[in-house]
C-alpha cells in the first residue's frame, strides 16, 4: 500500500485490544481545507516503540488503515480512498510490546466536520439575575454550534458546562456565579449536529470576579495637623487582595478589585460640595476638619460593601492668630491671610453643642489687605455670635472650593460673643483678713474661662479711699484669688475685679469695701 | 499668573542622563500634587510620573520604572525628573502638571529630550 | 497601545456636533473620575473637561462630558475651525497604579 492512502488490508499486528488503561485517546478528526483532511489524537503512556495505526471503516463495511509510525498526526487528502461525503467511523490502534491499544471511535462525514474556533477575540462578561452571561461574536463561517465550558477556583480542579446550542453572529452562555471566590472560566465549539466532529481548542482564560468583592479590612491613622493646615491620612493596613485561579495569575483584566476612598468633610457645611471619591492609592492629605471616610471596594460588577471610619476634628487651637474688633456698626475678624484669591469658610459653633450643625460664611476669594491679613465683618443685627456664650471659631481656606481635598486649616479657636466685656466680669468677689496688713481676694471664675485661651488675666484694683491712691495686680488666668499686702489698718479700701481677653478690656465688677481693723495691744 | 516651566532638555547618548526641572509660580506649590507627562514626536500623551504635595507618595509608569526618579523641593517652588539609563524610546517633548483630584489642571510648555548616538 | 482606546480621528463640518468615546476598564475609567484635553497644533495640553462632565472656567459650553460604565465621551456642538485639534482622556488606573491617556483622537472641522 502507498503511504498516502489508506491500506485496505489487514493490519500487521494481531488485533485484539489489551484493554489498559494508557494508549490512544482524544480522536479528532476534521477538514482543513477544500481537499484536505486532518486526524490527531493523545497518546497516555510510555511511548518508546508505539506505532499508531488510524484505522476506518466505510459504510459499505469495508475497513483500511493508516500507518503512522510515532506520529500523532495525520494528514490526508480526498483521494487517499476515506469516503469524505458519507459516514465513516474511524479510531486509533496503538501497537507496542506485542500489544494492542484500541482508542475510543468517532463517527462522521468528513467534508462536514469544519475544525471549529473557540471563541475569539473580546468575551464580554456580565451579570444577570445572579447568573454570570458571557457573550461572543461568532468566528467568521462558523455560525451554528455546540458550545461547552470549564470552570475552576482557585481551590477547585476544572468542572465541566454546557452552553447549549447557538445559531447566530454573536453566542452566548449562562454559568454560575460563585459570591466569593474568583474564578477561571474557558469555553470551547464544535459544529452542530454532528457528535463525532471534534471539539476546538479551550479560549483564553476568561477571569471573573466573586458577585460580592471582598469587604476592605483596612484601618486609618491620621497625623498631626503639618503648618500648612494639612494633615496626612494613611492607611496603617492594605485591604487584603483576592486569591486567584491558575490561569488568572499576573495581569488578568476583569477579575481585579480596587478600591475607592470617599470623604465626606463634615465642617464647613456650606461650600460647595461635601463629598469626593478618590483612588485609593492616592491617600489624601485633609484640614482639621472632621470627616468621614468609607473605603469601598468594586469589582467589574459594580461595588460592593464599603466600611466607615469617623475622624475627628483636629482640636488643637491657636492661640493669637485671631483678632476681632466689636464697632457701633458690628464686627470684624482678622486673620492671616494666605496666598491670593483665597476663598475662606468661617465656621462657629458654641461650645458644648457639637452634636448641632454649626453656622458658618463662605467668603468671596479675596487677596491678602496690605497688612497681610484676611477678614470677615457681620453687622449686629445679623446676630452671629450674638449671644454672651463661649464659641469655637474654625476657618479654613482654599483656592479651589469646589475641591474637597484641597481646604487647609488656617485656625481654630475660641471667641466669647456678644458683649465679653460686661458678660465676663467677676462676681462673688470677697476679701477675707489674711495678717495684720494683707488680705486675701476671691471671686468666682470668669465666664470668659470657660472659653480656652479667651481669658488673658484678671486684674484686681484695689483703691485707697483716703489718699485715692490706686493699684493694680495682674492675676493669671487659672488663678482666682490675689492676696493684697502693705495695707494700713482702719483705712478703707475698696477692691474691683476685671477679666481682659487679648483684645478687649473687660468692665470692672461692683466694689467691694473692706478694712483692716486696728489691733489694741493689752 | 499661574505658571509652570520646564528646563534641561537637550541632546543625549543611549544610557546617558538628564535632570528635567519645573519651576512653579503664582499658586502655593506645596498644596499641590504634580505629574511628568511626555509627548513622543508625533505621538500621544503618555503619563510618566506622580508625586503628592509632601513627597510621601510617588508612582512612575512601567516604561521608566527602576530608571527615572521624581522629586520636589517646596522650598523652591520646583519640581525634578532624573533621568538614567536613557534610550532612544525616551526621546520626547516632557511637560510638567499640576494635579487638582485627578485632573491636570495646569501644564508647562515642555522641555524637549533628545537620546541619540 | 494605550490602555484607553479612542478613535484615531473624527471629523465634521463647521456648526456641526461631534463626540470623541474613551473606553477602558473597571479599574480605571470605571471607578475613577475622566478628564479630556485639547491639545492645539504646536501647543501644551489643556484641560478640557474634569470629573467626567465639569467645565474649568473659561471653556465654553460647546464642550461637555458624559460618563456610564467603563467608557467616556466628549461632546463638541457648534464645530468651529478653532475647534481643530487633538483630544485625549486621561483618568487614573488602580489596578496599575498610574496615570493613563487615550491615544487621542484627531479632529478635523472640514
Known amino acids: 500500500c502507498r503511504t498516502s492512502e489508506c491500506c485496505f488490508q489487514d493490519p500487521p499486528y494481531s488485533d485484539a485490544d489489551s484493554g489498559s488503561a494508557s494508549g490512544p485517546r482524544d480522536l479528532s478528526c476534521y477538514r482543513i481545507s477544500s481537499a484536505g483532511y486532518e486526524c490527531s489524537w493523545q497518546y497516555e503512556g510510555p511511548t518508546a516503540g508505539v506505532s499508531h495505526f488510524l484505522r476506518c471503516c466505510l459504510s459499505s463495511g469495508r475497513c483500511c488503515y493508516f500507518a503512522t509510525g510515532s506520529a500523532t498526526r495525520l494528514q490526508f487528502s480526498d483521494q487517499a480512498g476515506v469516503s469524505v461525503l458519507h459516514t465513516v467511523t474511524l479510531w486509533v490502534e496503538s501497537w507496542a510490546r506485542n500489544r494492542t491499544e484500541k482508542s475510543p471511535e468517532v463517527t462522521l462525514q468528513l467534508y462536514k466536520s469544519v475544525k471549529y474556533k473557540p471563541p475569539l477575540g473580546d468575551i464580554k462578561v456580565s451579570k444577570l439575575a445572579g447568573q454570570l452571561r458571557m457573550e461572543w461574536e461568532t468566528p467568521d463561517n462558523q455560525v451554528g454550534a455546540e458550545v461547552q465550558f470549564r470552570h475552576r477556583t482557585p481551590s477547585s480542579s476544572w468542572k465541566l458546562g454546557d452552553c447549549g446550542p447557538q445559531d447566530d453572529d454573536t453566542e452566548s452562555c449562562l454559568c454560575p456565579l460563585e459570591m466569593n471566590v474568583a474564578q477561571e472560566f474557558q469555553l470551547r465549539r464544535r459544529r452542530l449536529g454532528s457528535q463525532g466532529s471534534s471539539w476546538s481548542k479551550w479560549s483564553s482564560p476568561v477571569c471573573v470576579p466573586p458577585e460580592n468583592p471582598p469587604q476592605p479590612q483596612v484601618r486609618f491613622s491620621v497625623e498631626q495637623l503639618g503648618r500648612d493646615g494639612r494633615r496626612r491620612l494613611t492607611l496603617k493596613e492594605q485591604p487584603t487582595q483576592l486569591e486567584l485561579p491558575e490561569g488568572c495569575q499576573g495581569p488578568a483584566p476583569g477579575v481585579e478589585v480596587t478600591y475607592q476612598l470617599q470623604l465626606h468633610m463634615l465642617s464647613c457645611p456650606c461650600k460647595a460640595k461635601a463629598t469626593r471619591t478618590l483612588p485609593l492609592e492616592k491617600m489624601p492629605y485633609l484640614s482639621g476638619a472632621a470627616y468621614n471616610v468609607a473605603v469601598i471596594s468594586s469589582n467589574r460588577f459594580g461595588p460592593g460593601p464599603n466600611q466607615t471610619w469617623h475622624i475627628p476634628a483636629d482640636t488643637h487651637t491657636e492661640p493669637v492668630a485671631l483678632n476681632i474688633s466689636v464697632g457701633t456698626n458690628g464686627t470684624t475678624m482678622y486673620w492671616p491671610a494666605r496666598a491670593q484669591s483665597t476663598t475662606y469658610c468661617i465656621e462657629w459653633q458654641p461650645v458644648g453643642q457639637e452634636g448641632s450643625l454649626a453656622t458658618c460664611n463662605l467668603t468671596a476669594p479675596q487677596d491678602p489687605d496690605p497688612a497681610g491679613m484676611a477678614t470677615y465683618s457681620w453687622s449686629r443685627e445679623s446676630g452671629a455670635m450674638g449671644q454672651e456664650k463661649c464659641y469655637h471659631i474654625t476657618i479654613f481656606a482654599s483656592a479651589h472650593p469646589k475641591k474637597l481635598t484641597l481646604w487647609s486649616t488656617v485656625l481654630s479657636t475660641y471667641h466669647f460673643g456678644g458683649n465679653a466685656s460686661a458678660a465676663g466680669t467677676p462676681h462673688h468677689v470677697s476679701v477675707k483678713n489674711h495678717s495684720l496688713d494683707s488680705v486675701s481676694v476671691d471671686w468666682a471664675p470668669s465666664l470668659l474661662s470657660t472659653c480656652p485661651g479667651v481669658l488673658k488675666e484678671y486684674v484686681v484694683r484695689c483703691r485707697d479711699e483716703d489718699s485715692n491712691q490706686v493699684s493694680e495686680h495682674p492675676v493669671q488666668p487659672t488663678e482666682t484669688q490675689v492676696t493684697l499686702s502693705d495695707l494700713r489698718a482702719g483705712v478703707a479700701y475698696t477692691v474691683q475685679v476685671r477679666a481682659d481677653t487679648a483684645w478687649l478690656r473687660g468692665a470692672w465688677s461692683q466694689p467691694q469695701r473692706f478694712s483692716i481693723k486696728v489691733q489694741v495691744s493689752d | 499668573e499661574v505658571q509652570l516651566v520646564e528646563s534641561g532638555g537637550g541632546l543625549v547618548q543611549p544610557g546617558g542622563s538628564l535632570r528635567l526641572s519645573c519651576a512653579a509660580s503664582?499658586?502655593?506649590?506645596?498644596?499641590?500634587?504634580m505629574n511628568w507627562v511626555r509627548q513622543a514626536p508625533g505621538k500621544g500623551l503618555e503619563w510618566i510620573s506622580y508625586?503628592?504635595?509632601?513627597?510621601?507618595?510617588?508612582y512612575y509608569a512601567d516604561s521608566v520604572k527602576g530608571r527615572f526618579t521624581i522629586s520636589r523641593d517646596n522650598a523652591k517652588n520646583s519640581l525634578y525628573l532624573q533621568m538614567n539609563s536613557l534610550r532612544d524610546e525616551d526621546t520626547a517633548l516632557y511637560y510638567c502638571?499640576?494635579?487638582?483630584?485627578?485632573?491636570?489642571?495646569?501644564w508647562g510648555q515642555g522641555t524637549t529630550v533628545t537620546v541619540s548616538s | 497601545q494605550s490602555v484607553l482606546t479612542q478613535p484615531p480621528s473624527v471629523s465634521a463640518a463647521p456648526g456641526q456636533k461631534v463626540t470623541i468615546s474613551c473606553s477602558g476598564s473597571?479599574?480605571?475609567?470605571?471607578?475613577?473620575?475622566v478628564s479630556w484635553y485639547q491639545q492645539l497644533p504646536g501647543t501644551a495640553p489643556k484641560l478640557l473637561i474634569y470629573?467626567?462632565?465639569e467645565r474649568p472656567s473659561g471653556i465654553p459650553d460647546r464642550f461637555s462630558g458624559s460618563k456610564s460604565g467603563t467608557s467616556a465621551t466628549l461632546g463638541i456642538t457648534g464645530l468651529q475651525p478653532g475647534d481643530e485639534a487633538d483630544y485625549y482622556c486621561?483618568?487614573?488606573?488602580?489596578?496599575?497604579?498610574?496615570?493613563?491617556f487615550g491615544g487621542g483622537t484627531k479632529l478635523t472641522v472640514l
Open positions: 503664582g499658586f502655593t506649590f506645596s498644596s499641590y500634587d
Open positions: 470629573d467626567n462632565n
Open positions: 473597571s479599574s480605571n475609567i470605571g471607578n475613577n473620575y
Open positions: 502638571a499640576r494635579e487638582i483630584e485627578d485632573s491636570m489642571d495646569v
Open positions: 486621561g483618568t487614573w488606573d488602580s489596578s496599575l497604579s498610574a496615570g493613563v
Open positions: 508625586i503628592n504635595s509632601r513627597s510621601s507618595t510617588i
